[in-house]
């Protein structure tokens, strides 16, 4: 895909990383077996991967999360792919909704999104979930990626 | 992607098998409406797709299961994409958990999984479920893919 | 991917809309921040992806629903990506299943499908559910893809 | 220079333990991967376990699921293989690898040990 100078592949897949913030949006980090396959596609700020061209990209991500109805609000846990280009507006592009396990103390489960969504040059997507304190940062359960078509 | 003979498409998707076997190991075959591009990605022992060419990969699995809270273990039903590379440490790429289901006699959950990775000539991947006697087989219900970018 | 004249990029992303009729085939549209890169991929009837060129193609399906385990019937809530080839069967290419919450009024959950098939020219993919009526619309909650290789 | 020493290997019977030990130096400890391979005579050399620093999170083959446990002491440097129920087909030279992705070639590199003997026999 994207053979040649005049065309490099673009793909990333990055780690999810716990973060002392009380924001909603996930952080990321480039370790363990992750991909940034050059500068075109970069990781900010450790919470957005922002594209440098313009495109049609398949996006992703999968959270997985542990949290019990009755320690839960009523609401479900949701995740959310959002994106952010220069001079729009923020949009989501994705969600998922799970309801909260009864399994104490808490019930994992997994979400995964994706889709082919069209990017302008410094376009950021990033997730946002509705309790952060909720997700598993253990080895391969949440992780978030894109590739170029 | 991947055209001309330089550059052939490079993409499998296999179905899942029941199996005797008592490995964590998930089984697939060639069989219903599976894929599989041509001999630079090879299904191997029915458990693993092994790739001839180094690049980066779009893998993916998803995985249908019936369980049940009381009749299983405390730890949730999990599903593990993994990576072998020849003098590599194997290791896990994707992950996901989902808590055992109250409903009798096993309430049916599925689990979806998928990332870009970066495979080295000779790497295979395989899909370890915690609990193989629980997988769904039913037409459509659990398979196993990639595309090469 | 399928750069120049020769090899357009082709790719389709699809947002739910809700439907009067009561088929089990879910309905689509070309709303809010859709896809729709060229016409060797349209959408049919609201209901259907239809292709003009054979080829791989990476197929995707996401549904969010909202049920609940004494209002609905016993079987799961399950989720088909089906294709339809002229002159073949209709098949089912994946399948998901969830078991419907205890949760009052009901459970919201999510479901993820995605796979590599060969598809023939003119050949359509469409989604099938066991209950239309317990989808959900809400933006980025539900919706159905593909990209070709 | 990274360096890695095995030590701990020997002659154990059926069913018996050893603890192997890969003492590093000449990097950062826990910023790299550590692992363990072995090499049975006539046979290619085969993953064991593993242990990531991303986290701590263990990895094993199959064939030593229940029986092998990796570890890792930061603060020495060391890398641990507890061998547990031992059988004969587990007689084989072991050894000790490091994994860490060099950012600027983007690709693993690994260093190895010298090896280790551990022989299973009554």
């Known amino acids: 895909m994207q053979k040649g100078d005049q065309n490099p592949q673009i793909a990333a897949h990055v780690i999810s990383e716990a973060s002392s913030k009380t924001t909603s949006v996930l952080q990321w980090a480039e370790k363990g077996y992750y991909t940034m396959s050059n500068n075109l596609v970069t990781l900010e700020n450790g919470k957005q991967l922002t594209v440098k061209r313009q495109g049609l990209y398949y996006i992703y991500a999968q959270v997985t999360f542990c949290s019990n109805r009755e320690a839960s609000s009523q609401a479900p846990f949701i995740a959310s792919l959002c994106l952010k280009s220069p001079g729009r507006f923020e949009r989501i592009l994705l969600r998922a909704a799970n309801t909260h396990s009864s399994a104490k103390p808490c019930g994992q489960q997994s979400i995964h999104l994706g889709g082919v969504f069209e990017l302008q040059p410094g376009a950021s997507v990033f997730v946002n979930v509705t309790d952060p304190s909720q997700v598993s940062h253990g080895t391969g359960f949440t992780s978030f990626g894109l590739l170029k078509l | 992607m991947q055209k001309g003979d330089q550059n052939p498409q490079i993409a499998a998707h296999v179905i899942s098998e029941a199996s005797s076997k008592t490995t964590s190991v998930l089984q697939w075959a060639e069989k219903g409406y599976y894929t599989m591009s041509n001999n630079l990605v090879t299904l191997e022992n029915g458990k693993q797709l092994t790739v001839k060419r180094q690049g980066l990969y779009y893998i993916y699995a998803q995985v249908t299961f019936c369980s049940n809270r009381e009749a299983s273990s405390q730890a949730p039903f999990i599903a593990s994409l993994c990576l072998k590379s020849p003098g590599r440490f194997e290791r896990i790429l994707l992950r996901a958990a989902n808590t055992h289901s109250s409903a009798k006699p096993c309430g049916q959950q599925s689990i979806h999984l998928g990332g870009v990775f970066e495979l080295q000539p000779g790497a295979s991947v395989f899909v370890n479920v915690t609990d193989p006697s629980q997988v769904s087989h039913g037409t459509g219900f659990t398979s196993f893919g990639l595309l090469k970018l | 991917m399928q750069k120049g004249d020769q090899n357009p990029q082709i790719a389709a992303h699809v947002i739910s809309e809700a439907s009067s009729k009561t088929t089990s085939v879910l309905q689509w549209a070309e709303k809010g921040y859709y896809t729709m890169s060229n016409n060797l991929v349209t959408l049919e009837n609201g209901k259907q992806l239809t292709v003009k060129r054979q080829g791989l193609y990476y197929i995707y399906a996401q549904v969010t629903f909202c049920s609940n385990r004494e209002a609905s019937s016993q079987a799961p809530f399950i989720a088909s990506l089906c294709l339809k080839s002229p002159g073949r069967f209709e098949r089912i290419l994946l399948r998901a299943a969830n078991t419907h919450s205890s949760a009052k009024p009901c459970g919201q959950q999510s479901i993820h499908l995605g796979g590599v098939f060969e598809l023939q020219p003119g050949a359509s993919v469409f989604v099938n559910v066991t209950d239309p009526s317990q989808v959900s619309h809400g933006t980025g909650f539900t919706s159905f893809g593909l990209l070709k290789l | 220079e990274v360096q890695l020493v095995e030590s701990g290997g020997g002659l154990v019977q059926p069913g018996g333990s050893l603890r192997l030990s890969c003492a590093a130096s000449?990097?950062?400890?826990?910023?790299?991967?550590m692992g363990w391979f072995r090499q049975a005579p006539g046979k290619e050399r085969e993953f064991v376990a593993a242990?990531?620093?991303?986290?701590?999170?263990?990895y094993y083959a199959d064939s030593v699921k229940g029986r092998f446990t990796i570890s890792a002491d930061n603060s020495k440097n060391t890398a641990y293989l507890q061998m547990n129920s031992l059988k004969p087909e587990d007689t084989a030279v072991y050894y000790c690898?490091?994994?860490?992705?060099?950012?600027?070639?983007?690709?693993?590199?690994?260093?190895w040990g010298q090896g280790t003997l551990v022989t299973v026999s009554s």
């Open positions: 000449g990097f950062g400890f826990g910023s790299y991967d």
């Open positions: 242990i990531y620093s991303d986290g701590g999170s263990a």
């Open positions: 690898a490091s994994d860490h992705y060099d950012t600027d070639t983007k690709s693993d590199v690994y260093n």
